[in-house]
């Protein structure tokens, strides 16, 4: 079997056995190495030596393999966007940033860039859950049976009816999905002024 | 020493478009951010646009969001920057300029700029 | 974006004199995570591109006289010339790089009083 070739080496079709960790030079026709992560082209690459790296400086990464001169600076996440920091910047990688509570990710470029304020829910209704925070805006779905949601709200969960006889109450009237099961004390008549749930 | 030359002055008439050259020369031209400025007569200096040319991805002023294109051409090491349905407020020198110390930091190298004159 | 404002808009002051400039942003330019400030000052004479004189709010580009000196945090900067010489006449502007959509303030005038 023909011995691997290690950088540098001649290519005719300017093409590189690794593309990921490899890149061709088009001044001699060679393949190089890139720079891990972390580190930048500190001096190319030539027919008889390979591509020289040194770390990036502080306040600065580069996150692929490449063949930079230089690398990029550390940038915050800006909060005027709607974003935070989840993760500071290393060599190796960009600050690591994610829509605020309450936001979602509403223009994305590569990775988001901008955050909105997630819309309400309005009563009967609550947020689907989603597999990712932040992913998305809002998708209301109505409470499930026995359920109710009574405000307008990015946030607020469906809640389970009150059983007015767990606390020895009779029912006044029925739960919606819009609002609690009203409870009354078996020994009284409601009084007509009493509208909501009778709290123990 | 890096230099950054730019194309020669532009008279352009309303609603046509104007393409401006940047060609740089003594630094790797691909591993630095160019960036577009321009400045109104007696006015102040306003960013447009960028573009990394080893990436090849742009980034632009919303301002200038759909009337600008930025480009690079790595063989030559040339960047340009094209503005399109020209009108008199576009009248300006117009700069193109990069950082040093790191790919996309402050600008320090800037070009000698290109007057761009619109006018019927 | 962000916005920088800066103020005077013109300044007029007697040669070996101090002269401030004062540059403020709409929101902070303080990354807390490496406690910098991406914000720099430039100098620009007539018919020429501005040249860079300050990064990082306080740090001289190499070759600036150490008569320029920078200052400041968060939002509020200010650019000191402690005794103004006659080819410091210029306009000078600070910019932010906090985001990569650069902004500047719209610049103050330094004339000689």
């Known amino acids: 079997s023909q011995p691997q070739a290690v950088p540098p080496y001649a290519s005719e079709n300017q093409t590189c056995r690794d593309q990921e960790k490899e890149y061709y030079e088009p001044q001699h026709r060679i393949c190089c190495s890139r720079c891990p992560p972390g580190t930048y082209v500190s001096a190319k690459c030539s027919r008889i030596r390979d591509t020289v790296c040194a770390t990036c400086a502080e306040n600065s990464y580069n996150e692929h393999w490449n063949y930079l001169t230089i690398c990029q600076l550390c940038r915050p996440c800006d909060p005027v966007m709607g974003l935070e920091e989840i993760a500071p910047c290393t060599s190796k990688r960009k600050t690591q940033c994610r829509c605020q509570p309450g936001m979602f990710c509403a223009a994305w470029a590569l990775e988001c860039t901008h955050c909105e304020l997630l819309s309400d829910c309005p009563p009967g209704t609550e947020a689907e859950l989603k597999d990712e925070v932040g992913k998305g805006n809002n998708h209301c779905v109505p409470c499930k049976a026995g359920h109710f949601q009574n405000t307008s709200s990015p946030s607020a969960r469906c809640q389970p009816h009150t059983r007015c006889e767990n606390q020895g109450l009779v029912e006044a009237a029925p739960g919606t999905a819009q609002s609690d099961t009203t409870c009354k004390n078996p020994l009284e008549p409601l009084p007509p002024e009493m509208s909501g749930t009778m709290l123990m | 020493q890096v230099q950054l030359v730019q194309s020669g002055a532009e008279v352009k008439k309303p609603g046509s478009s104007v393409k401006v050259s940047c060609k740089a020369s003594?630094?790797?031209?691909?591993?630095?951010?160019i960036s577009w400025v321009r400045q109104a007569p007696g006015q102040g200096l306003e960013w447009m646009g960028g573009i990394i040319p080893i990436h090849g991805t742009a980034n632009y002023a919303q301002k200038f969001q759909g009337r600008v294109t930025i480009t690079a051409d790595k063989s030559t090491s040339t960047a340009y920057m094209e503005l399109s349905s020209l009108r008199s407020e576009d009248t300006a020198v117009y700069y193109c300029?990069?950082?040093?110390?790191?790919?996309?930091?402050?600008?320090?190298?800037w070009g000698q700029g290109t007057t761009v004159t619109v006018s019927s | 974006d962000i916005v920088m404002t800066q103020s005077p808009d013109s300044l007029a002051v007697s040669l070996g004199e101090r002269a401030t400039i004062n540059c403020k942003s709409s929101q902070s330019v303080l990354y807390s995570s490496n406690n910098k400030n991406y914000l720099a000052w430039y100098q620009q004479k007539p018919g020429q591109p501005p040249k860079l004189l300050i990064y990082?709010?306080?740090t001289r580009e190499s070759g600036v006289p150490d008569r320029f000196s920078g200052s400041g945090s968060g939002t509020d900067f200010t650019l000191t010339i402690s005794s103004l010489q006659a080819e410091d006449v210029a306009v000078y502007y600070c910019s932010q790089y906090y985001t990569t959509h650069y902004t500047f303030g719209q610049g103050t005038k330094v004339e000689i009083k």
């Open positions: 300029a990069r950082p040093s110390y790191y790919l996309d930091g402050w600008l320090d190298y």
């Open positions: 990082w709010a306080s």
């Open positions: 003594g630094g790797t031209f691909s591993s630095y951010a």
